[in-house]
Interface confidence: medium
């Protein structure tokens, strides 16, 4: 069952999503997708990377956090009720069949009356993350150089709080763990 | 193109406390992490520190992180370097970095500079 | 904290291939400190050339390469110019905060 987290219309929403790179440095592919994981990639996308940078993204949708710690969380900014529903965060591990698949569910309340928009800390409990900026996408994205072949050993998502501001400074304490290879 | 200019330097006396500024064009500053980075007279660089896009996380070089805040307005696509307490050894060019690409921006944050703005601590 | 060396000059001639160091007090370098160059031309004015240990900017000649060499973070200039003259900076990642090194000023005749 997917995992729930919860954001206020108006409000910036957040679903964590982390993985862990055999040798640093090292980006997996990952997309993000509106509704439920399918078999292959992700369905109704609305960001993805590549080995370098992300690649594609659409308004309102954007990763915030560092990579050094495997962070692909995905914002989604000014969320409003039609936000609700299942998210797909899906680690393109490259082999066949071997992508790893996370179903996240986001729901939505209506805004409390407040005089003027506040910072919040709004998501679940497990989450008190602080997330109030502006923007648009980037203006641009560029390419690095090549990277090394990739080969993952450890995916995770998160469930449970991590213990750093950096959001995952030991995924092994996270949620769910799954080690490959 | 991207362009980014430091101001705020000037001279300072000890103890005193300065607000350096690095306005921010040519790209959506607000998706970037951001860095300062200082060399003092005749010397090499040292690392400040750097703050994520939504300022979540801000991360300081251990010596400095008691003297200097780094803080952002992304409405405005400005970083900010608030020093207190500045000493002789403060007397440094100071800038700004941006890295190259957003999302790896973590691992190669030092790919695009300001000029630099001279801070001066004198009495 | 950590400490991290450069050499302090090196002497190179066109067309020549010439590898400057970086060295960490703490052991060896890594893909985890994510070794990065940062080229500094007269008037102060700094360009990166290689982050995540071996990851070009865009614009930046091939003739520079980045790697591991031993223990070591190595930037490589392959047929190197005159206008590479300049100091070259390294800058390692340690865990929630990055070290420059003190540079090395490479000079091309």
């Known amino acids: 069952s997917e995992v729930e987290y919860r954001a206020e219309v108006g409000q910036n929403a957040y679903l964590p999503c982390f993985y862990t790179p055999a040798a640093p440095g090292n980006l997996v592919p990952v997309c993000w997708g509106k509704g439920a994981c399918p078999v292959f990639e992700c369905g109704n996308v609305v960001l993805r990377t590549d080995e370098r940078d992300v690649n594609y993204w659409t308004s309102r949708y954007w990763l915030n956090g560092d990579f050094r710690k495997g962070d692909v969380s995905l914002t989604i900014e000014n969320v409003t009720l039609a936000d609700s529903g299942i998210y797909c965060c899906r680690i393109q591990i490259p082999g066949i069949m071997n992508d790893e698949k996370f179903n996240l569910k986001l729901v939505i309340k209506p805004a409390k009356v407040t005089p003027a928009p506040t910072r919040q800390r709004d998501f679940t409990a497990a989450f008190p993350r602080m997330l109030t900026t502006r923007g648009h996408g980037p203006a641009e994205t560029q390419t690095l150089g090549s990277l090394p072949d990739i080969n993952l050993t450890q995916i995770s998502t998160l469930a449970n709080e991590l213990r750093d501001s950096r959001l995952a400074n030991d995924l092994r304490d996270s949620g769910a763990t799954i080690r490959i290879g | 193109e991207v362009k980014l200019l430091e101001s705020g330097g000037g001279l300072v006396q000890p103890g005193g406390s300065l607000k350096l500024s690095c306005a921010a064009s040519g790209f959506d500053f607000s998706r970037y992490w951001m860095s300062w980075v200082r060399q003092a007279p005749g010397k090499g660089l040292e690392w400040i520190g750097e703050?994520?896009?939504?300022?979540?996380?801000?991360n300081y070089t251990p010596s400095l992180k008691d003297k200097f805040l780094i803080s952002r307005d992304n409405a405005k696509n400005t970083l900010y370097l608030q020093m207190s307490k500045v000493r002789s050894e403060d007397t440094a060019l100071y800038y700004c970095?941006?890295?190259?690409?957003?999302?790896?921006?973590?691992?190669?944050?030092?790919?695009?500079w300001g000029q630099g703005t001279l801070v001066t601590v004198s009495a | 904290q950590a400490v991290v060396t450069q050499e302090s000059a090196l002497t190179t001639s066109p067309g020549e291939t010439v590898t400057l160091t970086c060295r960490s007090s703490t052991g060896a370098v890594t893909t985890s400190n994510y070794a990065n160059w940062v080229q500094e031309k007269p008037d102060h004015l700094f360009t990166g050339l290689i982050g995540g240990t071996n990851n070009r900017a865009p614009g930046v000649p091939a003739r520079f390469s980045g790697s591991l060499i031993g223990d070591k973070a190595a930037l490589t200039i392959t047929g190197a110019q005159t206008e590479d003259e300049a100091i070259y900076f390294c800058?390692?990642?340690?865990?929630?905060?990055?070290?420059f090194g003190g540079g090395t000023k490479l000079t091309v005749l």
């Open positions: 970095a941006r890295p190259n690409g957003y999302y790896v921006g973590t691992i190669f944050p030092f790919a695009y």
């Open positions: 703050i994520n896009p939504d300022s979540s996380t801000i």
């Open positions: 800058a390692l990642w340690y865990s929630n905060h990055w070290v």
